[in-house]
C-alpha cells in the first residue's frame, strides 16, 4: 500500500490521542534504553510503512501483535485516514487470522515495540524543509503544510 | 534517567566558530529530534535548529541558517552545535534539549547550557 | 512565522494569589484537534522546565496547581495558589509550524 496520500495529521492526532498510551501500557515495565533501535523510516509515507510492517507481520519470536490494543486502533485509524487502505488489507487480515496464536508478551515483542514508539515519534516530528531551505531531502508533506 | 551534558564555557574572539558539545545517556539517541536554543543575557528563548540523529537530518530557523551547523557523532551519542562568524550579539547561554518521547514537539530533557561570551 | 506574546510583561503577586499568564498567538497553533502549545518555567541559572504540553497536560512531576487552557490562538497558563518557588520566568512555546518560537516571557515576581 501507498502511504503517500493519506491524512498524516489525523494519524498523528489519533496516535498523540490514544495509540501513545497503548503502546506505553504494553511496554510498561520495560527500560528505555533497554534495546537498540535498528529500524527507521526517512518520511512520513515510509514511517507509516515500517509501522505498518512492524505492527501486523509476524516475525520470528513475535506473532502476535496484531491483537494488540494499540495495533487495533492503529489498524482502525490507517483505515480512516488512508483511502484505499482497508480494501488492501483484506487478505492480509484473513491470512492474519490463520496464523493467530495465543498472546504472548515476549522480549522479542518488547523489542518490536520498542522499535514502534521510535517510528512513530518519527512520523510525528520529521524535520521538515522549510521555505528557502534546501537542506533537507525528503519531501512528502507538500500537501500539509501545518505539519507540526 | 534521560540526561544531557554540555561542554564548558567559551570566551571568543568576534569573527571567530565556536563548537559547543552535548552528550546525551539513558535514551535512545538516535530516535530523538534534538534542538538547540539560545538564551542572550536577561532576554528570552531563542531556536537555532534541530537534527534527527538517526540520519543526520536537520530543520534551521532562518536566522542562524547560514552560520549555524548541526552535527552529531552517533558513536559517541553526541550533539554539537557550531555557529560561525561570532558577533557580540552572539553572547548566549546556549542549550541542547531533546525532543519528547511522542512527537508532541515539547522539550522534556535539557542540558544545563554553555555560556558563550563574545569579546574583543 | 508565528509570534507569540505573552502577557503582562511581569506580574507581582504574593504568595498564596492566583496567577494567569497569557499567551496569544498570531495565527492558529492547533491541527486536527490538538493544540501544539506547551508551557515551560525558568528560574535563574538553570535551564527552562516543561510545565505543560499541549495546551493543558501537566509535565511529569508538575504539581496540580498548575493549569492550562485555550485553543487556536489565545492560551492561559494559571497556577491556583502560588507558592515560593513559583516565582520565575515563563515562556510559551508553539511547534505547530516552524520555525519553532518561544513568547518573550512573563516575569511572576513576589509583590
Known amino acids: 500500500y501507498d502511504f503517500t496520500n493519506c491524512d498524516f495529521e489525523k494519524i498523528k492526532a489519533a496516535y498523540l490521542s490514544t495509540i501513545s498510551k497503548d503502546l506505553i501500557t504494553y511496554m510498561s515495565g520495560t527500560k528505555s534504553t533497554e534495546f537498540n533501535n535498528t529500524v527507521s523510516c526517512s518520511n512520513r509515507p515510509h514511517c507509516l510503512t515500517e509501522i505498518q510492517s512492524l505492527t501486523f507481520n509476524p516475525t520470528a519470536g513475535c506473532a502476535s501483535l496484531a491483537k494488540e490494543m494499540f495495533a487495533m486502533k492503529t489498524k482502525a485509524a490507517l483505515a480512516i485516514w488512508c483511502p484505499g487502505y482497508s480494501e488492501t488489507q483484506i487478505n492480509a487480515t484473513q491470512a492474519m487470522k490463520k496464523a493467530r496464536k495465543s498472546k504472548v508478551t515476549t522480549n522479542k515483542c518488547l523489542e518490536q515495540v520498542s522499535q514502534l514508539q521510535g517510528l512513530w515519534r518519527r512520523f510525528n516530528r520529521p524535520l521538515l524543509k522549510q521555505q528557502g531551505s534546501s537542506d533537507y531531502k525528503d519531501d512528502d508533506d507538500k500537501h500539509h503544510h501545518h505539519h507540526h | 534517567e534521560a540526561q544531557l551534558v554540555q561542554s564548558g564555557a567559551e570566551v571568543k574572539k568576534p569573527g571567530s566558530s565556536v563548537k559547543v558539545s552535548c552528550k546525551a545517556s539513558g535514551f535512545t539517541f538516535s530516535t530523538y529530534n534534538m534542538h538547540w536554543v539560545r538564551q542572550a543575557p536577561g532576554q528570552g528563548l531563542e531556536w537555532i535548529g534541530a537534527?534527527?540523529?538517526?540520519?543526520?537530518?536537520?530543520s534551521y530557523n532562518q536566522k542562524f541558517k547560514d552560520r549555524a551547523t548541526l552535527t552529531v557523532d552517533k558513536s559517541t551519542r553526541t550533539a554539537y552545535m557550531e555557529l560561525s562568524s561570532l558577533r557580540s550579539e552572539d553572547t548566549a547561554v546556549y542549550y541542547c534539549?531533546?525532543?519528547?518521547?511522542?512527537?508532541?514537539?515539547?522539550?522534556?530533557?535539557w542540558g544545563q547550557g554553555t555560556t558563550v561570551t563574545v569579546s574583543s | 512565522e508565528i509570534v507569540l506574546t505573552q502577557s503582562p510583561a511581569t506580574l507581582s503577586l504574593s504568595p498564596g494569589e492566583r496567577a494567569t499568564l497569557s499567551c496569544r498567538a498570531s495565527?492558529?497553533?492547533?491541527?486536527?484537534?490538538?493544540?501544539?502549545m506547551h508551557w515551560y518555567q525558568q528560574k535563574p541559572g538553570q535551564p527552562p522546565r516543561l510545565l505543560l504540553y499541549?495546551?493543558?497536560n501537566l509535565g511529569s512531576g508538575i504539581p496540580a496547581r498548575f493549569s492550562g487552557s485555550g485553543s487556536g490562538t489565545d492560551f492561559t497558563l494559571t497556577i491556583s495558589s502560588l507558592e515560593p518557588e513559583d516565582f520565575a520566568v515563563y515562556y510559551c512555546?508553539?511547534?505547530?509550524?516552524?520555525?519553532?518560537?518561544f513568547g518573550q516571557g512573563t516575569k511572576l515576581e513576589i509583590k
Open positions: 534539549a531533546r525532543e519528547d518521547d511522542y512527537g508532541e514537539g515539547y522539550f522534556d530533557v
Open positions: 512555546q508553539q511547534i505547530n509550524t516552524d520555525p519553532l518560537t
Open positions: 495565527e492558529s497553533v492547533d491541527n486536527s484537534g490538538l493544540s501544539f
Open positions: 537534527i534527527y540523529p538517526g540520519n543526520g537530518e536537520t
Open positions: 499541549r495546551a493543558s
